[in-house]
């Protein structure tokens, strides 16, 4: 799966949008979850309303909002009040029992408010020396990753 | 009419490969999983994997990974399940099947609600 | 896997009798189950899907019942043309798996 990156400004509302075969996807109901390392288990955020016929219902965990547009096939995640601990690589998912397929892997950067002037050295995005692989780019702001970036900061 | 036609009986000898068919019609191939099941003789049903023609997205039961091919070419809305070397215990039906799309209450599923007719494979020295 | 686990394997029953097979799944597998007949000689047909939802052509005497890990066939009176076999197929997970079959005799 090539990895698309979806740029927000920091205390603004992101949203991202998977687009999916909804034919192929057809009853199956929906999930948004956080990677934990380049290697780790993806940790579920939110999903999708319990009852398939209802997933277009927007269901909240926090400050993410799932809702899933199941004939249109799009599935849409709000992240609202987006803060700079909110970067970092996500998935959209298709649930099939209690396995997943993967509809696509997002990367969400966070960006300075140009109107706030606190310190935003804890903002983190890619910088142009870091890269990663299979990357493509879609504006909402979005792009996807240039070939060789990496989704994760470098660890000290 | 909606239906699965199956390629006819085949007698093959061991270590021979083979390719079967499922032609389908009267519906939109390419947006239905279509699965395959095998029927040795005397015995039950045993399911062997699944394909999404749209997009080749095949998954195969462990049972069977490795031991078939299961592939598909949707601008004919045929479906394929095949052996490189065949083996006497490879003798069976086989059936392809089309997992229709059911809304039942509030949820949506799946059944195989389209049957090919069956295709007979002997295996034998 | 999920084991999907059918009994009676076989069963002697008579014209006019109420019968009743089950099928156990090995984990919870919500109700997405389906009930199937197979004739001597021919593909299977569906008769049930999502634990208790009669196909389209299917008689009302047969029903469906379960949720989670216990589901349940009942044909309320038997017709010469139900003596076969019956299958339940979970499609919860891959790999999809049948039950082992039961068996439906005239006595």
């Known amino acids: 799966h090539n990895t698309t990156v979806f740029q927000g400004v920091a205390g603004q509302s992101l949203q991202v949008s998977c687009p999916y075969d909804s034919m192929k996807h057809w009853g199956r109901r929906k999930a948004w979850c956080r990677q934990l390392g380049e290697k780790g288990p993806c940790q579920r955020v939110v999903s999708t309303h319990n009852l398939w016929l209802l997933s277009f219902l927007r269901r909240w965990n926090g400050s993410t909002a799932i809702t899933d547009d199941t004939l249109g096939g799009t599935l849409t995640i709000t992240l609202r009040n987006l803060q700079p601990h909110d970067a970092g690589l996500y998935q959209c998912q298709s649930l099939h029992g209690s396995e997943a397929d993967t509809l696509r892997k997002v990367l969400v950067e966070v960006l300075a408010d140009p109107l706030d002037h606190r310190d935003a050295g804890d903002l983190w995005f890619p910088g142009e020396s870091e890269s990663f692989e299979d990357a493509h780019v879609e504006h909402s702001i979005s792009r996807s990753l240039l070939e060789g970036e990496i989704p994760f900061p470098p660890t000290s | 009419e909606v239906q699965l036609v199956q390629s006819g009986a085949e007698v093959k000898k061991p270590g021979e490969s083979l390719k079967i068919s499922c032609k389908g019609s009267?519906?939109?191939?390419?947006?239905?999983?279509i699965g395959w099941v095998r029927q040795m003789p005397g015995k039950g049903l045993e399911w062997m994997g699944i394909?999404?023609?749209?997009?080749?997205?095949?998954r195969y039961s462990p049972s069977f990974q490795g031991q078939v091919t299961i592939s598909a070419d949707k601008s004919i809305s045929t479906a394929y399940l095949q052996w490189s070397s065949l083996k006497a215990s490879d003798t069976a039906m086989y059936y392809c099947?089309?997992?229709?799309?059911?809304?039942?209450?509030?949820?949506?599923?799946?059944?195989?609600?389209?049957w090919g007719q069956g295709t007979t494979v002997t295996v034998s020295s | 896997d999920i084991q999907m686990t059918q009994s009676p394997s076989s069963l002697s029953a008579s014209v006019g009798d109420r019968v009743t097979i089950t099928c156990r799944a090995s984990?919870?597998?919500?109700?997405?189950l389906g009930w199937y007949q197979q004739k001597p000689g021919k593909a299977p047909k569906l008769l049930i899907y999502?634990?208790?939802s009669l196909q389209s052509g299917v008689p009302s005497r047969f029903s469906g019942s379960g949720s989670g890990t216990d589901f349940t066939l009942t044909i309320s009176s038997l017709q010469p043309e139900d003596f076969a076999t019956y299958y339940c197929?979970?499609?919860?997970?891959?790999?999809?798996?049948f039950g082992q079959g039961t068996k439906l005799e005239i006595k």
């Open positions: 197929l979970q499609n919860y997970n891959y790999p999809h798996t």
């Open positions: 394909i999404y023609p749209g997009d080749q997205d095949i």
């Open positions: 099947a089309r997992y229709g799309r059911y809304i039942y209450g509030y949820g949506g599923y799946h059944g195989m609600d389209v």
């Open positions: 999502a634990a208790s």
């Open positions: 984990q919870a597998i919500r109700d997405d």
């Open positions: 009267g519906f939109s191939f390419n947006t239905y999983w």
